[in-house]
């Protein structure tokens, strides 16, 4: 009996998570990504904010920039020039959209310990970067691109047509930033800094979304964003390259668009430099099932860029859209013409292929009923990539090395057995030539970052092990987590179940489904998290489940492309199917089941609540899409085609939340949205509310004034407190 008595007394000293813990970020973790500057050196910002250079081989470290210098301009970020002569310091950070922000930049000269005076940079700057070699600067100011040969030099203006909300040079417009490039920049230096490539986006003809920003003034401001919704006019993109050695000599040269792409509406999807005189551009038809990779060469005689048809590689999907979320980007080999790329194999799984002359002749490098996720690095003898192959868990990520310098190429899992229970979800960061690399493990245990030798894979040192977090969690009753699968009608539904600490299968628990469910997403991942749902399980005794249904990623094209042109159908069906299976498990109180989601998850939760199944007592939709006609063209059309009669208008109309207004009558619905949501416009929730009012259906709602899609800051606390009250009330849990 003694051990059991000790166990009980230990449990009594442990406490459940509180909502305050979550809102205060008490149990957040740290990761360590080295800022590599060579094969064996990296920079890191120390705890006291000094910028320190570490040399792995000598074991030495020294401060290259003191916290005093950082503080003198209130810098929150920095960037060392490749010749190590200068550092830019970034301050006055002002967020714009998901990736974009403006800032003030100061250049610090390391050789004399002073800030560069004369020809200072204008403010605020939209984007700034060093050339990959030396210390040239390229920056974007007021939608135009400027070049400096040295930080103290006067700038050379490359573009002159930049205009707010009209012409964007070197930076993306809203839709390219959010849905195509996923960056704040649209300019790319060639490997040795000879050329600078950039995109020009012309938004002149794009319809504008306008919404009020209330602020503190007597009159609200109106925010105007050129935002192409499904079927609307899209940005017109052009790619230019300028010789930065003699920028005035011939000026920017436009890169030709492949003829098969230029024949109708198209997108530019990414640019990859191969050598200083060879560049690879990827293009996509507006109907996003055809992608063309075009390799272009510099013609010295004409000072132009030539993209021969023989160097055009077409990637086409016959079962869905091209690629996963985005079309994958190539990783070039040392011959500077052949490359490695992830795309679907004949069995419908995304795998690494080696392409030399044609895509038809591609050599498949990885294969199996799992997917290659990312190619990190290709060296002369090794290719490093991540996949979810190990033990057939799609929600894991391990790092593999394929020896490509010999035949047959041998494969080794670098991470599978390192910390098997603690670490099942990795990413990696490589130094030049993959001499060293950092592994960042995200869970399921407490995250840990380690440094490794690129030849032997030996662990050199622990970079961050989150000891304080480990100690803080020692007296916390964390919920239990299970990742399992359901087999239903030839579909595998992976789920994560979060169970109360003293879970007892013979008891009945309220169930909350947390859903995202968007195309090419994955919610069931072996990662560490102490968040709101952890609290709901730990303190409030709820069971929470996340389910990856049709349309989700990394389990093959059959599952991924099942939702093609039919958003809002199978994602919802699969959540409902899973709930029925959970009820069959015997520990769910079927009178107390709720569903909640944010963004795409808000759309799915709304449709699930309005499915008429009677399964859900209540639910929450945060910033939901309510009609695909209201969302961005690039994202929506990828999965839905066009909202035209001769394409897919019928399903656009059939898949709205508003069309199901009547069905909300028998559920408790909480609808939440930020009024300044630039992404999923407040319009979406306004239309749901209007439809519910017109149908005389009661519901609850909360708006967050001047908040965007992230509902950050104090709104976060208010949001989670409000949702907690709603759920506790729904589940008849005492406050």
């Amino acid at each position: 009996l003694r051990p059991s008595r000790v166990h009980n007394s230990e449990e009594n000293t442990m406490r459940a998570l509180t909502l305050k813990d979550i809102l205060n970020g008490t149990f957040s973790y740290k990761t360590f990504f080295p800022n590599w500057i060579s094969g064996q050196e990296y920079l890191h910002q120390s705890a006291d904010n000094n910028i320190v250079l570490y040399n792995i081989e000598t074991g030495q470290s020294y401060t290259i920039l003191s916290n005093r210098t950082m503080k003198s301009v209130n810098a929150s970020n920095y960037g060392l020039s490749p010749d190590r002569q200068f550092v830019y310091l970034e301050s006055d950070y002002s967020k714009l959209w998901r990736y974009s922000y403006t800032a003030t930049y100061y250049i610090y000269d390391l050789s004399n310990g002073e800030f560069v005076r004369g020809n200072e940079l204008p403010r605020p700057i939209q984007y700034l970067c060093w050339s990959p070699v030396g210390s040239k600067l390229a920056y974007v100011y007021q939608n135009n691109i400027y070049l400096k040969q040295r930080p103290g030099d006067p700038p050379f203006q490359i573009t002159f047509n930049g205009r707010e909300n009209k012409i964007f040079n070197g930076i993306p417009d809203w839709v390219y930033e959010e849905e195509m490039l996923a960056t704040k920049y649209a300019l790319w230096w060639s490997p040795n800094g000879k050329f600078l490539a950039y995109a020009e986006f012309n938004d002149t003809d794009i319809p504008v979304i306008a919404y009020s920003y209330y602020g503190d003034e007597q009159y609200p401001r109106t925010i105007n964003i050129p935002y192409p919704k499904a079927g609307a006019k899209n940005p017109v993109v052009r790619i230019f390259i300028i010789d930065t050695t003699y920028p005035a000599y011939v000026g920017p040269q436009e890169v030709p668009v492949p003829a098969m792409i230029a024949s109708s509406d198209y997108y530019f999807s990414w640019l990859t430099w191969v050598t200083d005189e060879r560049v690879c551009l990827q293009w996509l038809k507006r109907v996003q099932n055809v992608s063309v990779l075009s390799i272009c060469d510099f013609r010295e005689d004409w000072q132009t860029w030539d993209c021969p048809k023989t160097q055009e590689h077409i990637e086409e999907s016959r079962t869905g859209w091209a690629g996963g979320f985005f079309v994958s980007t190539p990783v070039f080999s040392y011959d500077a013409i052949s490359y490695y790329k992830i795309f679907s194999d004949k069995d419908g799984y995304k795998h690494i292929h080696y392409i030399k002359d044609t895509v038809e002749n591609a050599i498949q490098i990885t294969s199996g009923k799992w997917e290659a996720i990312n190619i990190f690095r290709v060296t002369q003898d090794s290719l490093f990539y991540s996949s979810n192959e190990f033990e057939e868990y799609p929600g894991r990520r391990n790092i593999y090395r394929i020896s490509i310098g010999s035949y047959p190429p041998s494969k080794k899992c670098v991470t599978c057995h390192l910390r098997k229970e603690r670490c099942q979800y990795y990413t990696a960061s490589f130094s030049d030539y993959a001499k060293y690399y950092a592994l960042v493990c995200y869970g399921p245990g407490i995250p840990i970052s380690t440094l490794h030798d690129g030849r032997t894979d030996q662990e050199i040192k622990i970079l961050e092990e989150n000891k304080e977090l480990e100690n803080a969690l020692k007296n916390i009753q964390l919920p239990k987590e299970e990742i399992k699968k359901l087999e239903v009608d030839e579909i595998t539904l992976w789920y994560k179940m979060i169970l109360p600490p003293q879970f007892d299968r013979s008891k009945k628990y309220p169930l909350l489904i947390q859903v995202y469910g968007g195309p090419c997403s994955q919610s069931v991942r072996s990662v560490f998290a102490v968040n709101w749902i952890s609290y709901l399980a730990s303190k409030e005794g709820m069971v929470i489940a996340l389910v990856d249904g049709r349309g989700t990623a990394f389990q093959g094209d059959k599952l991924l492309y099942a939702v093609y042109r039919k958003l809002g159908v199978y994602e919802v069906e699969d959540q409902i199917t899973a709930v029925r299976k959970f009820i069959e498990m015997g520990f769910i109180d079927e009178k107390r089941i709720a569903i909640w989601g944010w963004s795409y998850g808000g759309y799915v939760s709304s449709l699930a609540l309005a499915s008429g199944t009677g399964l859900f007592k209540c639910g929450i939709a945060v910033a939901p899409v309510s009609s695909w006609e209201y969302y961005a063209s690039v994202y929506t059309e990828r999965f839905m085609g066009l909202p035209t009669k001769d394409d897919n208008l019928e399903h656009y109309k059939n898949s709205t939340v508003m069309a199901r207004a009547e069905y909300f009558r028998n559920v408790d619905y909480l609808l939440i949205h930020g009024t300044a949501d630039d992404n999923v416009h407040f319009q979406n929730s306004a239309q749901i509310a209007k439809a519910l009012v017109n149908a005389q259906v009661d519901f609850q709602a909360m708006w967050y004034s001047d908040q965007n899609h992230g509902l950050s800051g104090l709104s976060t606390n208010h949001l989670y407190t409000h949702m907690t009250h709603f759920l506790k009330q729904c589940f008849s849990l005492s406050d």
């Epitope: 021969p308 040392y334 011959d335 013409i337 030399k356 050599i363």
Partner: antibody, heavy 122, light 106 residues
Amino acid sequence: EVQLLESGGGLVQPGGSLKLSCAASGFDFSRYWMSWVRQAPGKGLEWIGEINPDSSTINYTPSLKDKFIISRDNAKNTLYLQMSKVRSEDTALYYCAGGYYRYPYYYTMDYWGQGTTVTVSS
Amino acid sequence: LVMTQSPASLSASVGETVTITCRASGNIHNYLAWYQQKQGKSPQLLVYNAKTLADGVPSRFSGSGSGTQYSLKINSLQPEDFGSYYCQHFWSTPYTFGGGTKLEIK
């Protein structure tokens, strides 16, 4: 020492068939791409085709695709060329060649046999 | 892809330097090999990747070029260098050979 020894050549009538063999020794045959190359009397070299180590990829020169079949038996360390529907222009010295893997993903013809002669005549 | 070799034949003396060229009908991106074939013998690999010497090949041989134009240079010709030379591309199948260059003693 690496050795490739072709056999099976000889006189064959137009429209007939013949199977050439290439016995390999002195290297790990099962890890090498192998090729067949021919040389008509007094003429240059003509690439016939190649086969990868596990026989999953076989490429031919288009004009010979329908009449020649390349295969291999790694257990016997032997490469084969099955010739059918032969014509007088198929008269040549037939070489088998094998080579090292060269990064990235191609193979040179480092080792050559001494060749076997095929004469097509009625 | 068609490989055009020139000259078709060439006479030179021991100690001389000679250059043989090979033109491809399309860009073969350095995927080129050179072979030497002596009378009555099998071909022997000299150069691959356009400029890398195969094991055991004397340093008087050198390969160069890019795109569609390639050449093989032999410095200070030795008696054993006489014979036929062939280029072959490895860019895409079929891996065609050039027509050959016959190098004879003057």
